[in-house]
Interface confidence: low
């Protein structure tokens, strides 16, 4: 009688000794086996030797087996699959002239502290490898020329610092890289050659940036749309694209494919795309929408550009849903903006809760304006260009409501201006109201000119405890106040420099709300300059703090809407968190200082 | 009943390249490995190359490296793809069909005959 | 690589008698799991492709006459040609099919005296 169960399911004979408490290959094993488990053993060392006469050997799985030891001392001509995973390996021998049929290799979940140079050698049929969750501090220049037709690399949870220059090269067939939780802090210029990698890993590293990463920030550029995040369980072609998940570990987290890299020296010789930072700016305008969410015992400032870097990103940094798959083909026109995206913060309490809305727009006037052309074409370098669409969804486990959802889309060119529309909104079945849609639709810029000065009325404060509306008019144009939005707008069809109008109105709660009390004071603050040279800041703040109970039919919606001619365009829109124990929203930086 | 015929033989010099066809019929292509035999003339049989129905290739050292077999299920093909030819490659090569994953060479085409020569 | 080694070089017999070859290989051929040999004998006439006659050892394949046969064990094998007709003369091979690479003999040319 077989310790092990056979079964014949393929053309193959499959013999599984999974967790049989063998501590070598039992005896009775058929002649004719091509498929051998032997996971879940203790078998310490294992010799490919003993499996020689397997002449139809062709999947080995030898993971969870307690190895410390490998040896390849018997050919085994047909293995295609070799699984080593959870052992404890501190090295590989050479492979490549015992198993020269091998297209997977599975070593991850061991303790490889190196690889040695030739360790793939004649592994010419070599198609995955499984490298991740080791203790690789480095790599050998030319592993892979060996493994040519090499289409899944996995090296993620290592802790390579440095990547030689020339590790892909040759590598036409690669289409998956998993680089991420490593100590990587730049990519080899020229590391990415000419492929085209449809699912890219890169977040979780210590990317430093500076102007070394001039070539590394260019390439997410390029390849937005195949920079993912990886997500435990979840096929990588189950999620959406996330560029932004790529950061900056030196500058605030944030995003490396948005770094500006000014004053960094360029000539053609010293990068492969970053020639061209001194072409002369053309009309930018730059929005931040910040959301501070403070609790007694807990506070989490939804903030721009910034990831808690001490938890897991991995499991932080919310995944998106599929909106497109990526191709290997490269479009003509490149989308590559994208939102930052957020840390989860801890599930709070329904205590009394401080809310902070902070529109920041800072509008960068210049004599430079746009012609919209009829076909997408990609811009000159210096224009921050737009993601068409991405989407941000909530991990099921999360019983907290975050923004959950960030969607931008690219209308069609037009010489007319078209609103910038901005919508948040909470989920119903929340214990707390914290914004979870954020829409955002840009253009490119309009031929209209953009205005230099702005007025803005503050009316007096209500002195009334819970006013449920403030509203700042211009002479000439008022908008009416309307239920649960804030709203800035400009008039329609204006020429001339456009006063600013805008409406702030608090969310009207709906009729199965409880115990629902309101405290409002909206506080505006605004710079204006008025030579054409500088920029035109306006920042709004609207702080307001709500005990309440929530029932799962609240709904509330705050929305920002540039109407035309604000020329507002929003490349770049980013909610993280951050957590402090601080329990004053005044103690709180985005409470301390208002700006004259 | 099956049948392998092998083309694209000749004469060829050192260090040039031939690639070798070889046509099934008779049976189910795709589910059978498939293998290269060489004879030089007046001398004995040597295997040069197996692939296996998945298309996993294998070779003796003699040629790996220079030779690769390669399938085309669709047009019920085998290819030897022979590059850095020497002297001693010249001899008729044969196609033939492997039993299984046994390795023993159940049919044989009529051989395909390749001379290196300057 | 297993090394096969074919003995004798050529054999003379006549018609209706035994033939007998030998093939020793340098390594066991036996796996012990299936008490199996891996060796295949083939024939091999004048201007043509060799045609397979016995695998693991002993195993006839469909359409060979019963008068050839095949045994031995280990490293020691025989081919045996019962009653030997016209139609025999030709060279025969062994290989051994249990190690990669496959292994060929020198061959026998087996002739009509």
């Known amino acids: 009688q077989h310790t092990c169960s056979i079964s014949k399911v393929t053309s193959l004979l499959e013999v599984n000794c999974e967790n049989k408490k063998l501590t070598a290959l039992p005896a009775d094993l058929p002649a004719d086996t091509g498929i051998l488990h032997l996971g879940e053993n203790q078998l310490g060392t294992f010799s490919t030797a003993s499996l020689v006469h397997f002449t139809h050997l062709t999947y080995l799985y030898l993971d969870r087996c307690e190895l410390t030891s490998l040896q390849t001392n018997g050919k085994l001509i047909k293995l295609e699959n070799l699984d080593l995973s959870h052992n404890n390996l501190k090295s590989l021998p050479s492979l490549g002239w015992a198993l020269p049929a091998l297209t997977t290799l599975d070593v991850s979940f061991n303790k490889l502290g190196s690889l040695s140079p030739g360790v793939l050698d004649g592994l010419s049929q070599l198609q995955e490898l499984y490298l991740q969750n080791n203790d690789l501090k480095s790599l050998p220049p030319g592993l892979l020329l060996p493994t040519t037709k090499l289409k899944k690399l996995n090296l993620a949870n290592n802790k390579l610092r440095e990547l030689p220059s020339g590790l892909l090269d040759g590598l036409e067939d690669l289409d998956t890289l998993y680089l991420q939780r490593n100590w990587l802090r730049t990519i080899p210029k020229g590391f990415f050659g000419t492929l085209l990698l449809p699912f890219v890993f890169l977040h979780a590293n210590s990317w430093y940036c500076d102007c070394e990463i001039l070539y590394f920030r260019h390439w997410l550029q390029e390849n937005a749309n195949n920079v993912y995040l990886w997500k435990q369980g979840v096929d990588v072609k189950d999620t959406t694209p996330n560029v932004a998940s790529v950061r900056c570990a030196n500058l605030d987290n944030a995003p490396v494919y948005s770094y500006p890299g000014k004053g960094c020296p360029t000539s053609s010789g010293d990068t492969d795309y970053d020639d061209y930072d001194d072409i002369p700016d053309v009309p930018a305008t730059r929005t931040e929408v910040k959301f501070s969410t403070n609790t007694k015992v807990h506070t989490t400032h939804w903030s721009l550009l910034a990831a808690a870097p001490s938890t897991s990103q991995d499991s932080q940094m919310i995944s998106l849903p599929p909106t497109h798959k990526p191709t290997k083909k490269q479009s003509t026109f490149i989308h590559t903006q994208s939102p930052g995206f957020t840390t989860l913060p801890e599930t709070m309490e329904s205590n009394p809760t401080f809310y902070s809305l902070k529109l920041n727009t800072v509008l960068i006037p210049s004599p430079t304006t746009l012609e919209p052309t009829s076909t997408q074409a990609t811009p000159e370098p210096n224009i921050q260009p737009m993601l068409t669409t991405s989407t941000l969804t909530t991990p099921e486990h999360s019983t907290t409501p975050v923004p959950t959802t960030t969607i931008l889309t690219t209308p069609e060119h037009s010489t007319i201006p078209v609103p910038t529309t901005a919508i948040l909104t909470t989920p119903k079945p929340s214990t707390i109201p914290v914004p979870t849609t954020a829409t955002l639709t840009t253009l490119e810029p309009s031929t209209t000119p953009v205005p230099t000065t702005a007025t803005l009325t503050t009316p007096e404060p209500s002195t009334t405890l819970v006013p449920t509306t403030a509203t700042l008019t211009t002479p000439e144009h008022s908008t009416t106040p309307v239920p649960t939005t804030a709203t800035l707008t400009t008039p329609e069809h204006s020429t001339t420099p456009v006063p600013t109008t805008a409406t702030l109105t608090t969310p009207e709660p709906s009729t199965t709300l409880t115990n629902l009390v309101s405290t409002i004071s909206p506080v505006l603050t605004t710079t204006l300059t008025t030579p054409e040279s500088t920029p035109i800041e306006t920042i709004l703040e609207q702080f307001f703090t709500t005990e309440l109970t929530l029932l799962p039919t609240l709904e509330s919606t705050t929305t920002i809407i540039p109407e035309q001619n604000s020329f507002l365009n929003l490349p770049e829109v980013a909610l993280v968190s951050s957590d402090t124990s601080e329990s004053s929203p005044f103690l709180n930086s985005d409470f301390c200082c208002f700006l004259p | 009943q099956v049948q392998l015929v092998e083309s694209g033989g000749g004469v060829v010099q050192p260090g040039r390249s031939l690639r070798l066809s070889c046509a099934a019929s008779g049976f189910t292509f795709s589910s059978f490995a498939m293998s290269w035999v060489r004879q030089a003339p007046g001398k004995g049989l040597e295997w040069v190359a197996s692939i296996t129905s998945a298309g996993t290739p294998y070779y003796p050292d003699s040629v790996l490296g220079r030779f690769t077999i390669s399938r085309d299920n669709s047009k019920n093909t085998l290819y030897l793809q022979m590059n850095s030819l020497r002297a001693e490659d010249t001899a008729v090569y044969y196609c033939a069909r492997s039993r299984g994953y046994e390795d023993y060479f159940d049919y044989w085409g009529q051989g395909t005959l390749v001379t290196v020569s300057s | 690589d297993i090394v096969m080694t074919q003995s004798p070089d050529s054999l003379a017999v006549s018609l209706g008698e035994r033939a007998t070859i030998n093939c020793k290989s340098s390594?066991?051929?036996?796996?012990?799991?299936?008490?199996?040999?891996?060796l295949a004998w083939y024939q091999q006439k004048p201007g043509q492709p060799p045609k397979l006659l016995i695998y693991?050892?002993?195993t006839r394949e469909s359409g060979v006459p019963d008068r050839f046969s095949g045994s031995g064990s280990g490293t020691d094998f025989t081919l045996t040609i019962s009653s030997l007709q016209a139609e025999d003369v030709a060279v025969y091979y062994c290989?051994?099919?249990?190690?990669?690479?496959?292994?060929f003999g020198g061959g026998t040319k087996l002739e009509i005296k």
């Open positions: 390594q066991s051929l036996l796996n012990s799991r299936n008490q199996k040999n891996y």
């Open positions: 693991f050892t002993s």
């Open positions: 290989q051994q099919h249990y190690s990669s690479p496959w292994t």
